[in-house]
């Protein structure tokens, strides 16, 4: 039995499609293709003759349409006009002419979408973000993507206004990336050029750890005092020390060379943060032994958490 | 007190290159980054990169990648800045400078400058 | 890059003026914003970083403000030593950049 095969089925706009006749009967001398469901003279696209391989234009002809001598027609550079049915009439030998339709779907093109953001810096725990993809599509599927995987399922994440909005409630650090937004229809997609979502974040509660000399944290008079201080922030913090109260360096590591009982105290590390307008900071005491005795670092630290 | 003391003016003629040289003293040399500005004649300020002392980790402003190295030796806090291919318009006074603190700071103390001059 | 741009570029007061200076940035700068005074053949000399933070010995007749892109160096009452170019300059992460300058003088 005679059929036509469009390939492809969905066609975007711009693009070709191909008409393929499938079971052609052995005494067939001609074709003709219609646009439509059924043989009308107005609706006549082109006419062959297989003996000339001759081919002639009819009143539906628009100039895209190329026939081939195995009955297939090629239309090329589709508007969104060109969608519906196709009747391949191939005319016998015998004179008992046989038909088949076909059909397509034109889709238009998409354009390559864009993302807006209502905030690129977002602070964490406190601001949620809105990415908006553009432009609006009817009969379009929209889709997100995060850091090139497809979007997390997490209730802070929601999507709204048929997926062309994505909110991200009380952004998390984690959040943090590359957004892209797709759109797709039957015969196309297209994905925007990613986004990089910055949250800004912390500073968190710092830590203090000793460093080389001594390990085991034991400070025995005459001994290095080599403190650092680390706390996890974007961007990095700004860090402060002050020994008993009195302002020190702005470093992150805290040296003091040969270290006697005056030593004895409160060491405390500020970092702030002036992104997120947030600071911490942690206190430790500090005990010298003059003797062989080594009370080191006090084990209860204490920190301070500022907003 | 802290003391940022730079080598002597330097003539260098076009396709050369120069090396100058930053001693600290008077802080512990491998707490604060080092940075590198320069000033042309009349001209403002320019941020040229920076050495981190304590790693040697290196960031170079874009217009300088490829012609400048910055280096330090740890044993005498010298820092060094080699800048390559020079052409007319590298002729200006270079300042290194110490990071007010780490991370986000700006610079609080200046070398004295050291004018190079390139000139055929 | 970020872009410091700072107006105005010269300026000409006289003693006891009040002086305004202004600094934009090309981004969000989150107050990391440094202000330098440059005398004629002399280093620059750091005198107000986090925006507003004074350095310690600078006169207290300067003061910083501003904030997200905008910044103002505000000289309350001039003085004939104050006479020099000021530069702002963003402090957050690298590459720095610093405004073109402005070169204040006494009428």
């Known amino acids: 039995k005679l059929t036509i095969e469009s390939t492809p089925f969905n066609v975007a706009e711009g693009k070709e499609v191909l008409l393929l006749a499938h079971n052609l009967p052995q005494n067939r001398i001609g074709y003709s293709w219609y646009k439509g469901e059924r043989v009308d003279g107005n609706s006549l696209i082109v006419g062959y003759v297989i003996g000339t391989q001759q081919a002639t234009p009819g009143p539906a002809y628009s100039g895209r349409e190329t026939i081939y001598p195995n009955a297939s027609l090629l239309i090329q550079n589709v508007t969104q006009n060109d969608t519906g049915f196709y009747t391949l009439q191939v005319i016998k030998s015998d004179l008992v002419n046989e038909e088949a339709t076909g059909q397509f779907h034109v889709y238009p093109e998409l354009p390559k979408p864009s993302i807006s953001s209502n905030n690129s810096n977002p602070v964490e725990d406190k601001d949620a973000v809105a990415f908006t993809c553009e432009p609006e599509v009817q009969n379009t599927t929209y889709l997100w993507w995060v850091n090139g995987q497809s979007l997390p399922v997490s209730p802070r994440l929601q999507l709204s206004n048929g997926n062309m909005t994505l909110t991200l409630l009380s952004v998390k650090r984690n959040d943090a990336g590359s957004y892209e937004c797709e759109i797709q229809n039957p015969a196309s997609a297209n994905r925007s050029d990613p986004v990089t979502l910055n949250v800004l974040y912390g500073p968190d509660v710092p830590t203090i750890s000793p460093i080389i000399s001594p390990p085991d944290s034991s400070y025995l008079s005459g001994a290095n005092l080599n403190l650092s201080c680390h706390s996890a922030s974007n961007p990095s913090p700004q860090y402060s020390w002050r020994i008993n109260g009195i302002p020190q360096q702005h470093t992150q590591v805290l040296f003091i060379a040969k270290i006697t009982p005056n030593n004895n105290g409160t060491y405390a590390c500020f970092v702030s943060n002036l992104a997120t307008g947030r600071n911490n900071s942690i206190v430790k005491s500090i005990t010298v032994s003059a003797s062989g005795t080594s009370p080191g670092l006090s084990a209860g630290a204490h920190h301070h958490h500022h907003h | 007190q802290v003391q940022l003391v730079q080598s002597g003016a330097e003539v260098k003629k076009p396709g050369a290159s120069v090396k100058v040289s930053c001693k600290a003293s008077g802080y512990i040399f491998t707490s604060y980054w080092l940075h590198w500005v320069r000033q042309a004649p009349g001209q403002g300020l320019e941020w040229i990169g920076y050495?981190?002392?304590?790693?040697?980790?290196?960031s170079y402003a874009q217009k300088f990648q490829g012609r400048v190295t910055m280096t330090r030796d740890t044993s005498t806090s010298t820092v060094y800045m080699e800048l390559s291919s020079l052409r007319s318009e590298d002729t200006a006074v270079y300042y290194c400078?110490?990071?007010?603190?780490?991370?986000?700071?700006?610079?609080?103390?200046w070398g004295q400058g050291t004018l190079v001059t390139v000139s055929s | 890059d970020i872009q410091m741009t700072q107006s105005p570029s010269s300026l000409s007061a006289s003693v006891g003026d009040r002086v305004t200076i202004t600094c934009r940035a090309s981004?969000?700068?989150?107050?990391?914003l440094a202000w330098y005074q440059q005398k004629p053949g002399k280093v620059p000399k750091l005198l107000i970083y986090?925006?507003?933070n004074l350095v310690e010995g600078v006169p207290s007749r300067f003061s910083g403000s501003g904030s997200g892109t905008d910044f103002t160096l505000t000289i309350s009452s001039l003085q004939p030593e104050d006479v020099a170019t000021y530069y702002c300059?963003?402090?957050?992460?690298?590459?720095?950049?610093f405004g073109q300058g402005t070169k204040v003088e006494i009428k």
């Open positions: 981004e969000n700068q989150y107050g990391y």
């Open positions: 300059q963003h402090h957050l992460g690298t590459p720095y950049t």
């Open positions: 400078a110490r990071e007010y603190g780490n991370y986000n700071y700006p610079l609080d103390y």
């Open positions: 986090n925006y507003k």
């Open positions: 050495i981190n002392p304590q790693t040697g980790y290196t």
